[in-house]
């Protein structure tokens, strides 16, 4: 009946509703049907959220913060539904809401505790800082404070830094890990316990490839089955690192099945893509193609980074000319 939020029953006629920042939620309240229905929703027993009586809304003394954000299920009131539809919740809306419902028979009060969570999709980034390589797991906006865990080759890492900045309504969090000189695979998990939402970032370094000039190279990129769900929207990006910054070679959007290619020598195999294999070919290599190639498969629930190091060496021909 209430699809926009989930709620947990707790004692003393109190329910907990968990909402998501900027989304709509329903604060549930029901009563034994009767005539002469009066409904008042209040916040923290002080601020007027919504009033209904004598057959219509009376919002003259509604607190301004709720203006144009609340409504009742008017066709359902006579059936005992006093639930409040609440638009675009913010973190400032967290707290206890009391619903007073009066009928010709009785007056009852229901309490609803609203908790609001934020979880903007995190990202896993690979950065070079001078001679050091870093993996950074970051989330731009999250609330409450998340749990971040790192694993190296599936073994938890105990020390991990967390750089945190708090804004008015949420946290912004960076968790960097120095992986200089490591060939291990790394995994970062960010969990929002309130929203029961987990995101995982996984980084894998492939063995270095040595190629001759004018040859072509095939670089593999296949999602790990544990994370990958083909019916979930995702994006695949291939990029190349040059002088510390990545330039995008190509990307693929699963929602539209669009492939955008920025490098004419880059090719993707459509059949492989249909089998969720995003390996790519780069033709006619030249010396400047040496570097790191990154495949990024990202959805709302995961980021899978696969990195290849390619060394392009001069062909015998070229060498003899020099």
């Amino acid at each position: 009946i209430f699809p926009l939020a989930f709620f947990i029953y707790v004692p003393m006629n109190e329910q907990i509703v968990i909402g998501r920042l900027d989304e709509d939620i329903i604060l549930p309240s029901s009563f034994e049907r009767g005539s002469e229905v009066v409904i008042h929703w209040k916040y923290q027993d002080s601020y007027k959220v919504h009033s209904y009586y004598k057959g219509s809304d009376h919002l003259e003394s509604q607190d301004p913060r709720y203006a144009n954000r609340t409504s009742l299920f008017y066709n359902e009131i006579q059936n005992g539904n006093a639930s409040l539809f609440f638009r675009r919740v913010s973190l400032l809306d967290e707290g206890i809401y009391t619903c007073y419902v009066g009928t010709a028979i009785q007056v009852i009060t229901n309490k609803v505790v609203l908790k609001v969570g934020v979880f903007l999709t995190p990202v896993m980034k690979y950065e070079k800082r001078n001679t050091n390589s870093f993996l950074i797991c970051s989330v731009l906006s999250v609330y409450p404070r998340p749990i971040i865990t790192w694993k190296m080759d599936n073994t938890p890492i105990s020390e991990n830094n967390m750089e945190e900045t708090g804004s008015l309504d949420s946290f912004s969090i960076n968790s960097p890990l120095n992986i200089t000189g490591s060939n291990s695979s790394y995994e970062c998990t960010i969990e929002n316990s309130l929203l029961k939402q987990t995101w995982t970032g996984r980084w894998t370094m492939k063995d270095g490839l040595h190629k001759m000039q004018s040859e072509h190279v095939s670089l593999s990129c296949q999602p790990v089955n544990d994370y990958f769900s083909p019916n979930q929207d995702f994006k695949v990006t291939w990029s190349r690192m040059k002088s510390g910054t990545f330039s995008v070679l190509a990307y693929y959007l699963s929602s539209s099945q669009n492939t955008i290619i920025n490098e004419s020598r880059f090719s993707w195999n459509k059949e492989l893509i249909n089998q969720s294999d995003f390996s790519m070919n780069l033709m006619d290599l030249n010396l400047s193609d040496s570097g790191e190639y990154l495949c990024n498969i990202s959805s709302d629930e995961y980021t899978l980074l696969t990195i290849h190091t390619v060394h392009v060496e001069p062909s015998q021909e070229t060498a003899s000319h020099n």
Epitope: E36, V38, K54, H58, T103, A104
Partner: antibody
């Protein structure tokens, strides 16, 4: 059972003040709107004021606006009417009455009334 | 404010009579009307609310009807206990108002 008992009535000179109280019992006081209604000797009923269940909304009859103040203490289950600048025409039996619920504005339970006489 | 005009102001009737009291509002009040009975020296007693809903414990010989501006209270068969004053009251607006009252006395 629901009980409403008014007190504080008496004889007072014009221009003076008086405070009426109503002690409520037998129901959850904080859930209901409360009213004062008066009746001049040999006359009809006149509504005076209402206060919402939570004390946030108050409304008054034009005849008493600016002179009378309705208030409530939900922790003590009491309703008060502070009457200032009293006039001869305020002479009446003052009834405290309980609303149907929080804001319906009609009266299910009544006290027996307390007489206020404004006379010099 | 909304004015409530009640008629008649006095009504003489006998036990067993069918009695009708009318109440007219100066503007539409939908069905937000209550009727009360009051006996001398006593507090009023609610009979009817929302124009036609009978309050719990009130005998079924009392009935209310009407909407908008015209309302009636009917006592189908007057009983000795029914000789009293009757008041209508509108609660459509923030300032509620009563009618002037109708005294039902023994003929």
């Amino acid at each position: 059972q629901v009980q409403l008992v008014e007190s504080g009535g008496g004889v007072v000179q014009p221009g003076r003040s008086l405070r009426l109280s109503c002690a409520a019992s037998g129901f959850t006081f904080s859930n209901y709107g409360m009213h004062w209604v008066r009746q001049a000797p040999g006359k009809g009923l006149e509504w005076v004021a209402v206060i919402w269940y939570d004390g946030t909304n108050k409304n008054y009859a034009d005849s008493v606006k600016g002179r009378f103040t309705i208030s409530r203490d939900n922790s003590k289950n009491t309703l008060d009417l502070q009457m200032n600048s009293l006039r001869a025409e305020d002479t009446a039996v003052y009834f405290c009455a309980r609303d149907r619920n929080t804001a319906m504005d009609y009266f299910v339970y009544w006290g027996q009334g307390t007489l206020v006489t404004v006379s010099s | 404010d909304i004015q409530m005009t009640q008629s008649p102001s006095t009504l003489s009737a006998s036990v067993g009579d069918r009695v009708t009291i009318t109440c007219r509002a100066s503007q539409s009040i939908s069905s937000w009307l209550a009727w009360y009975q009051q006996k001398p020296g006593k507090a009023p007693k609610l009979l009817i609310y929302k124009a036609s809903s009978l309050e719990s414990g009130v005998p079924s010989r009392f009935s209310g009807s009407g909407s908008g501006t015209e309302f009636t209270l009917t006592i189908s068969s007057l009983q000795p206990d029914d000789f009293a004053s009757y008041y209508c009251q509108q609660y459509n607006s923030y300032s509620v108002t009563f009618g002037g009252g109708t005294k039902v006395e023994i003929k």
